[in-house]
Interface confidence: medium
């Protein structure tokens, strides 16, 4: 159906509240440096305009595309040149080039300080004083820090955030109520951001086919009773939704996501028996619930995979006449039978199957050639299984902090050219896989661990792309999406690395370290560990353990001292000298 006014169409579909929220998110993701007040003003103006178009679709400018309207609005910002430099040049371009230009200037690492919550009474006063403004500020702060955040999901989290405050601001002990709830929400939001960034990277760097394959595998595991046609339909729609959100088309994205939720609920009988509860909820919760829904039980009567994909004499005909559809069916059938496999592994198996058919269908006797194809999957399955087993054992032995440090050492040796903050951030996140996945039952471990690692390694790839410093990182990031993790796992110590010059300033600590929260204290210590390794890349694990132990004792001693700053300035240089001597 063609609409006279696209903006009126979206305003009517989404409703004023969601419309305004999405516009605020869109502007905050594009102009990450602008103050909150500016964005509120822009969002208000666009919403008023949309409202007018909804009342009179043939009004002035109502027929313009959303990109034109949004771009024109962005280009009215007076401080564009000062704050964003060459991003202002985007305004010289015509659509669609102008929007592409804005997208290219999104900054994955804008360097804003972490969000620190004021004390609870002040927060509750602000919440009760102006709820809408309070939630708008939340949308703004998350969106500008995470320019690829999945916008409809951010609206859902803002709703959750509102719920937390509505409840906790009535509590006797506001701090005790807010603390754990806000922290739990923060964890979810950070994971959601990283997952969507991974989806956007798959679409942008590897194309629709890669994203669709990933989605077929994931949805086939989750909805094993649905047939391939149903999975394909949902995947096609889901791909459109994520393409829109990744491309900054947040209104279309949210609208299409709501349509997809509606479709799934209307067709739940042919998708999954687990959707009923989700489908009774309002739109934001419904979509979120569907995205997180538990896996359906496997149908009991699944025939052997071999019948269709190995024993059948028509395999090559099927493959050659419709390659993607045939491989999609294979992926679907394999995934629904193996909920315990990671999506990455399933995609590697499909790739191996494809390579086997490419080779065998060109021979004189294809059936003999591909007869053992399913047996050849064993090493591909064993590799992540062994990796998870070994690393979970290490995690159980060392705990999260110790495991993070082991990964820091591992990754710094693989790619010592990468910036220290990036190595610390990524290794800390990789280390969380232990806490997140190792306590799960055996049947869920691999899927949890490897798919989480893919998301974290994507963060490394995104940050590294901004300032490429290591050819081997570039190679692992760009060659194959599904083989990223094995590629990084397979990297050995970089023997070509020239050690960094020693800089005393890097190893100078002050009394402010003592008052930092535990997590930030860990980051300081881990930063020192990386710098130490960059200076002495040949250091053994034993030597590093000794030096880090001494360092921990030094921090503990000085933080307990009467004159903390004096202790740091006196004992610090001694520790550094001892460390240098120990690492010769």
């Amino acid at each position: 159906e063609a609409y006279k006014s696209e903006i009126a169409h979206r305003y009517n579909d989404l409703g004023e509240e969601h419309f305004r929220g999405l516009v605020l998110v869109a502007f905050s993701q594009y102009l990450q440096q602008c103050p909150f007040e500016d964005h509120v003003k822009l969002a208000k103006e666009v919403t008023e305009f949309a409202k007018a178009c909804a009342a009179e679709e043939s009004g002035a400018n109502c027929d313009k595309s959303l990109h034109t309207l949004f771009g024109d609005k962005l280009c009215t910002v007076a401080s564009l040149r000062d704050k964003y430099g060459d991003m202002a040049d985007c305004c010289e371009k015509q659509e669609p080039d102008r929007n592409e230009c804005f997208l290219a200037h999104k900054d994955d690492n804008p360097g804003f300080p972490p969000l620190v919550a004021p004390e609870p009474d002040a927060l509750c006063a602000a919440f009760q004083d102006n709820e809408q403004l309070f939630l708008g500020k939340y949308l703004y702060e998350i969106a500008r820090r995470h320019p690829y955040f999945y916008a409809p999901e951010l609206l859902y989290y803002a709703q959750q955030y509102k719920g937390v405050f509505a409840e906790c601001c009535q509590a006797a002990d506001k701090a005790a109520c807010l603390g754990p709830k806000i922290e739990a929400l923060r964890e979810k939001v950070l994971l959601s951001s990283a997952k969507e960034r991974f989806k956007c990277a798959s679409l942008q760097k590897f194309g629709d086919r890669a994203f669709k394959a990933w989605s077929v595998a994931r949805l086939s595991q989750r909805f094993p009773k649905a047939d391939f046609a149903e999975i394909s339909k949902v995947v096609t729609d889901l791909t459109k939704v994520h393409k829109e959100c990744c491309h900054g088309d947040l209104l279309e994205c949210a609208d299409d996501r709501a349509d997809l939720a509606k479709y799934m609920c209307e067709n739940q009988d042919s998708i999954s028996t687990k959707l009923k509860e989700c489908c009774d909820k309002p739109v934001l919760e419904k979509s979120q619930c569907l995205a997180e829904v538990e896996r359906d039980e496997l149908p009991g009567d699944l025939p052997s995979l071999a019948a269709d994909f190995v024993e059948d004499k028509e395999v090559c005909k099927n493959y050659q006449e419709a390659k993607d559809v045939f491989l999609g069916t294979f992926l679907y059938e394999y995934a629904r039978r193996h909920p315990e496999y990671s999506v990455s592994l399933l995609l590697r198996l499909a790739k191996e199957y494809e390579a086997t058919l490419e080779k065998c269908c060109a021979t004189d006797d294809p059936p003999t050639c591909y007869a053992k194809v399913l047996d050849e999957f064993k090493p591909l399955v064993d590799e992540p299984q062994n990796l998870v087993k070994t690393n979970c054992e290490l995690f159980e032995k060392l705990g999260e902090y110790g495991f993070q440090n082991a990964l820091l050492v591992r990754y710094t040796k693989k790619a010592p050219q990468v910036s220290t903050p990036t190595l610390v951030e990524v290794s800390r996140k990789l280390g969380k896989v232990g806490t997140k996945c190792c306590k799960k039952p055996e049947s869920e471990r691999m899927s949890c661990a490897e798919d989480f690692l893919s998301v974290v390694l994507n963060r490394l790839c995104v940050l590294h792309e901004k300032t490429p410093v290591s050819e081997r990182v570039t190679k692992c990031c760009s060659e194959s999406l599904v083989n990223r993790r094995p590629c990084f796992s397979g990297l050995e110590v970089d023997e070509t690395y020239v050690p960094k010059e020693f800089n005393a300033e890097t190893f100078t600590f002050h009394a402010d370290l003592c008052t930092l929260p535990e997590a930030e204290k860990q980051v300081k210590k881990q930063t020192a560990l990386v710098e130490l390794l960059k200076h002495k890349p040949k250091a053994t694990d034993e030597q590093l353990k000794t030096v880090m132990g001494d360092f921990g004792a030094f921090v503990e001693k000085c933080c307990a001292a009467e004159n903390k700053e004096g202790c740091f300035s006196e004992e610090g240089p001694k520790l550094v000298a001892a460390a240098q001597a120990a690492l010769v």
Partner: nanobody, 126 residues
Framework: EVQLLESGGGLVQPGGSLRLSCAAS????????VAWFRQAPGKEREFVAG????????YYADSVKGRFTISRDNSKNTLYLQMNSLRPEDTAVYYC???????????????????WGQGTLVTVSS
Amino acid sequence: EVQLLESGGGLVQPGGSLRLSCAASGRYIDETAVAWFRQAPGKEREFVAGIGGGVDITYYADSVKGRFTISRDNSKNTLYLQMNSLRPEDTAVYYCAARPGRPLITSKVADLYPYWGQGTLVTVSS
């Protein structure tokens, strides 16, 4: 669920033609891999022809190649089997079978088709 209903069978002379139809309900036929099987008295059920769902790849048993044509009309949600140059050995009950959500027929094995019609009798005799 998929319901299938065959029609168009009957008595025909050798060398004659017949067109069988199979009306599907409960699922769009273009999303479903469908096939015709036949069973002659005292014999195993055998694959005759098939067509992929989502992609129109057709398959034929060697014994009917060049004589039979499988097709479907998505707007009518119906599958057809056009049978020309009929021979006495084509006499059998013809069944329509479906594998929903399968984009390709990847098997001629009857057991892999969960949905079947009740069959229509074709007799080729002078």
